[in-house]
Interface confidence: medium
């Protein structure tokens, strides 16, 4: 029965995840009569950031005034559908995924802003938004056409700690080199100078030997 709610799944995309060996087409064709149809819109293509983060909006056309909504992100790749993450939320409240979920999200009216983190090139695939109106009855189910998320792995960077050590070593080397250069330069300059000169030669008249000057006191009459 394709309309059954999927089991809650603590997902890491590239770990062993629960998969359904049926295509999404099969999933859609065999939705029983008790699943009321609901339109769900999502973007066709999204490019993940260099940090492996992809965000997209999932919008549903609510047939009634739902107070509890369940949003599930499914990934379709190689003819298999895998649950990535799921969250149930009360209208007006925050969307809360499991603590270890790779998804985060916010809700606003009939829109859910979903963010999937930790994506790598091998996670490229079709990400389908499934929306269920849980309360009040009747139950409604809507499945989007999917968002093709492209993930391009960035060029491998050196390890950050290693980079830090290189930076520290180069900085230290430059410091000591400049210190040494300054010291050598100063010593060379000092060798060229007379120890009693100031570095500027001025022709001076001959001086008499210093003698103690005698001062006569002045009498200043005060009227």
């Amino acid at each position: 029965m394709a309309c059954l709610g999927f089991q809650r799944h603590k997902a890491q995309l590239n770990l062993a995840t629960r998969t359904w060996p049926c295509t999404l087409l099969f999933f859609l064709l065999f939705i029983p009569v008790f699943c009321k149809a609901m339109h769900v819109a999502q973007p066709a293509v999204v490019l993940a950031s260099s940090r492996g983060i992809a965000s997209f909006v999932c919008e549903y056309a609510s047939p009634g005034k739902a107070t509890e909504v369940r949003v599930t992100v499914l990934r379709q790749a190689d003819s298999q559908v895998t649950e990535v993450c799921a969250a149930t939320y009360m209208m007006g409240n925050e969307l809360t995924f499991l603590d270890d979920s790779i998804c985060t999200g916010t809700s606003s009216g009939n829109q859910v802003n979903l963010t999937i983190q930790g994506l790598r090139a091998m996670d490229t695939g079709l990400y389908i938004c499934k929306v269920e109106l849980m309360y009040p009855p009747p139950y409604y189910l809507g499945i989007g056409n999917g968002t093709q998320i492209y993930v391009i792995d960035p060029e491998p960077c050196p390890d950050s700690d290693f980079l830090l050590w290189i930076l520290a070593a180069v900085s230290s080397g430059l410091f000591f080199y400049s210190f040494l250069l300054t010291a050598v330069s100063l010593s060379k300059m000092l060798k060229k100078r007379s120890p009693l000169t100031t570095g500027v030669y001025v022709k001076m008249p001959p001086t008499e030997p210093e003698c103690e000057k005698q001062f006569q006191p002045y009498f200043i009459p005060i009227n």
Partner: antibody, heavy 120, light 107 residues
């Protein structure tokens, strides 16, 4: 095979509270596919829905009983409970716990029921 | 609240008879209706969900039909084990409500 077993039935004094538990075996109460509920049936009468609970703790009650009802879930014990306060003789009934799929607001598995009699 | 009215409240029939029980909702409920069978001292057992879908393990002699406000449970050929009370239940809006029941007795 899924089984639901009610416990806690018996005689309750008027004005007091009744507390019932339903233990689920052969399946997990933490499944995201199901809600768990309580339904009652006064002797010789029809069925009355009391409320539902989801493993996350979300609850839905019959508005006519809402002020007196509390349904809670204990996933570690794989059970859920019903508390009905300020009981009167009208609350004398067989109380059933049951399961429903999230897609359906009707119940596919039921416990065998436990009788609660409100009497002084 | 949506009122569910079942008719008849009781009926007598013989083994092999075709039995029809009707359920009327006080407002349109689309196909959000279930049928249950209850035997004395036992819990109800769901026979039909979504008005016409047969519950797994239930004999094919049971069938459901209808949409909107009028629904029917049909037992094509009554068997000895079918003598019981039958309830309809709407699952369209809160609170969930049941019909008053139809008791099927041996003629």
């Amino acid at each position: 095979q899924l089984q639901l077993q009610e416990s806690g039935g018996g005689v309750v004094r008027p004005g007091g509270s009744l507390r019932l538990s339903c233990t689920v075996s052969g399946g997990s109460i933490s499944s995201s596919s199901y809600y768990w509920g309580w339904i009652r049936q006064p002797p010789g009468k029809g069925l009355e829905w009391i409320g539902n609970i989801y493993y996350s703790g979300n609850t839905y009650y019959n508005p006519s009983l809402k002020s007196r009802v509390t349904i809670s879930v204990d996933t570690s014990k794989n059970q859920f409970s019903l508390k009905l306060s300020s009981v009167t003789a009208a609350d004398t009934a067989v109380y059933y716990c049951a399961r429903r799929r999230i897609q359906l607001w009707s119940f596919d598995y039921w416990g065998q029921g436990t009788l609660v009699t409100v009497s002084s | 609240d949506i009122q569910m009215t079942q008719s008849p409240s009781s009926l007598s029939a013989s083994v092999g008879d075709r039995v029809t029980i009707t359920c009327r909702a006080s407002q349109g409920i689309r196909n959000d209706l279930g049928w249950y069978q209850q035997k004395p001292g036992k819990a109800p057992k769901r026979l039909i969900y979504a008005a016409s879908s047969l519950q797994s393990g239930v004999p094919s002699r049971f069938s459901g039909s209808g949409s909107g406000t009028d629904f029917t449970l049909t037992i094509s050929s009554l068997q000895p084990e079918d003598f019981a009370t039958y309830y309809c239940q709407q699952s369209y809006s809160n609170p969930l409500t049941f019909g008053g029941g139809t008791k099927v007795e041996i003629k």
